[in-house]
């Protein structure tokens, strides 16, 4: 791991209780094609172990969704951000579903050891737990 | 190539016959900006040559499409998966077009030498063959 | 930098004058989480400093947008391309908003030292300048 090849790909475990917009993730070969090489999970949230610039990517699909459903429940928004430590709290990536049922995006961002990433889904629709429809990952790119 | 820098970016060649949902890809500098460095094409499907974790990405745009077209003919769905060997067959990435005319996403996934990736477009709309609208690629990330 | 780890992530600075569809970008730690390690900005456009295959990614969100706004102002299109040198001018990546308010995609493409990338937003809607909604970046992947 000293090469700095930190990488993780997570699948959705569950959503939080009603007032908690966070998605809770899980990863590991026993679960399918998800994995953590370097980063760790802390109560379903992804914690970074190595400083550097990372490619962060996410796809979230809403469960049993049609464009009518999505527009009727608008606004449904997904935000990826650093949620702890509080001093580094910031939104990194934000998308609304509008009349679609899936959002997918990616970005490069500097992350530091100890940063915990949260993925907040606001709205009243549930995310699909299918592993090919909803996933979240990071890849270390450079120091 | 021994550094493990396997990478490929493909452009759409053609769709299959009516009952075959697979998209058939092509790549190489003579065709424009597509290329294969490591992976190979087998009858238009991408075959992996090196074990590792890969970033798989795809964008597909529907031909002469408006949001009316896209919603009228729902469901149009794109799935990327391992289609052979059969023992490793699995869907890796799935998106529906709903009221949009383009889907784009990416994910990290472990792939093994000999895995062949298929991209299945279900529905009765044609994918655009423009090279800036429809493309598919993989990038080796780590062992 | 000799390792070839060229990478940049930019945030929107401003749009061009009315007849100029280009988006003008900015980057640097003083601005937030944007940065340039290798590539440079030339009058708000990204210039490549090292030959190689790059992962290019972008997300653009339209300002104060609903699906009604987006469909009423259709077509709104985002194209990423090499705009100079003129001899290498080509569109690399193109997406329309249709009834959505955000586009996001990525692709692998060969770029050469001196290539300048332009991001053209056609239509009458303005892009959001929020750094978690609109961003553009490149990552060197291999020679």
């Amino acid at each position: 791991e000293s090469l700095g090849w930190d990488v993780a790909e997570l699948q959705l475990n569950h959503t939080g209780p009603q007032q908690d917009p966070r998605l809770y993730w899980q990863g590991g070969p026993a679960l399918g094609r998800s994995f953590l090489h370097g980063p760790e999970l802390d109560k379903g949230q992804l914690r970074i172990h190595r400083d550097g610039i990372y490619m962060v990517h996410i796809q979230v699909t809403l469960a049993i969704c049609s464009s009518t459903t999505a527009s009727r429940h608008h606004p449904t928004t997904l935000a990826v951000g650093i949620c702890s430590p509080a001093s580094r709290s910031i939104s990194l990536l934000r998308l609304s579903f509008h009349q679609g049922c899936t959002i997918a995006s990616q970005r490069l961002t500097p992350l530091a050891r100890g940063d915990t990433l949260c993925t907040n889904l606001t709205g009243t629709l549930l995310p699909s737990r299918n592993t090919d429809e909803t996933f979240f990952g990071v890849q270390w790119v450079r120091p | 190539e021994s550094l493990g820098w396997d990478v490929a970016e493909l452009q759409l060649n053609h769709t299959g016959p009516q009952q075959d949902p697979r998209l058939y890809w092509q790549g190489g500098p003579a065709l424009g900006r597509s290329f294969l460095h490591g992976p190979e094409l087998d009858k238009g499907q991408l075959r992996i040559h090196r074990d590792g974790i890969y970033m798989v990405h795809i964008q597909v745009t529907l031909a002469i499409c408006s949001s009316t077209t896209a919603s009228r003919h729902h469901p149009t769905t794109l799935a990327v998966g391992i289609c052979s060997p059969a023992s490793r067959s699995i869907s890796l990435l799935r998106l529906s077009f709903h009221q949009g005319c383009t889907i784009a996403s990416q994910r990290l996934t472990p792939l093994a030498r000999g895995d062949t990736l298929c991209t299945n477009l279900t529905g009765t709309l044609l994918p655009s063959r423009n090279t800036d609208e429809t493309f598919f690629g993989v990038q080796w990330v780590r062992p | 930098e000799s390792l070839g780890w060229d990478v940049a992530e930019l945030q929107l600075n401003h749009t061009g004058p009315q007849q100029d569809p280009r988006l003008y970008w900015q980057g640097g730690p003083a601005l937030g989480r944007s940065f340039l390690h290798g590539p440079e900005l030339d009058k708000g456009q990204l210039r490549i400093h090292r030959d190689g295959i790059y992962m290019v990614h972008i997300q653009v969100t339209l300002a104060i947008c609903s699906s009604t706004t987006a469909s009423r102002h259709h077509p709104t299109t985002l194209a990423v391309g090499i705009c100079s040198p003129a001899s290498r001018s080509i569109s690399l990546l193109r997406l329309s908003f249709h009834q959505g308010c955000t586009i996001a995609s990525q692709r692998l493409t060969p770029l050469a030292r001196g290539d300048t990338l332009c991001t053209n937003l056609t239509g009458t809607l303005l892009p959001s300048r929020n750094t978690d909604e609109t961003f553009f970046g490149v990552q060197w992947v291999r020679p």
Epitope: - | L12, Q18, T61, A63, I64, T68, T69, R72, H73, G123, T124, L125, L126, S128, R129, N130, E133 | -
Partner: antibody, heavy 120, light 111 residues
Framework: EVQLQQSGPELVKPGASLKMSCKAS????????IHWVKQKPGQGLEWIGY????????KYNEKFKGKATLTSDKSSSTAYMELNSLTSEDSAVYYC?????????????WGQGTLVTVSA | DIVLTQSPASLAVSLGQRATISCKAS??????????MHWYQQKPGQAPKLLIY???NLESGVPARFSGSGSGTDFTLNIHPVEEEDAATYYC?????????FGGGTKLEIK
Amino acid sequence: EVQLQQSGPELVKPGASLKMSCKASGYTFTDYVIHWVKQKPGQGLEWIGYLHPYNDDTKYNEKFKGKATLTSDKSSSTAYMELNSLTSEDSAVYYCARRGYYDYAWFADWGQGTLVTVSA
Amino acid sequence: DIVLTQSPASLAVSLGQRATISCKASKSVSASGYTWMHWYQQKPGQAPKLLIYLASNLESGVPARFSGSGSGTDFTLNIHPVEEEDAATYYCQHSRELPPTFGGGTKLEIK
């Protein structure tokens, strides 16, 4: 086998309206758009519009807006076209047609046509 | 609307020879990497029959003596070798945008 069976010939007076039918069989009616095409005697073909029985989505050629109204009855797998304020210019054979496998406006299956004659 | 102009309006071709029908569009009907031009055959008292779709694809069940070519604005339908049963009127049609339009037709007579 896909079949589009159209209603019989009509002789109508100027100013009247008429509703012709196109009964589909051999496929799932709600899966395919039905298009309507006009052909005046000894002349070429003109696209009138389409209807998607799945959700009654319609599109009309500007030239036929206000002249033609497209509807369908899912229970009987039948598409209808109503023509109003008929004049001699509306005398023609009217065809219903179904798209091919791909969902674009080219026409793989046709009805036999309904001949409309407008005459006092 | 896109205007399609067919030529000639009529032609007579000997049995076994080649018939060539031209269709010219007022603007390009190519888009998204496809050419949205189609060809039909219509015999007297019958509905049109699809022969060729997307400029060059033969519809199922259509004999291989029919072929289509062209891109952009200029298109050709070839019939070779012509047979007696090919006597009919031939129409080109585009589906590049709404409304789809048809050419004026070319009447083929077999000598």
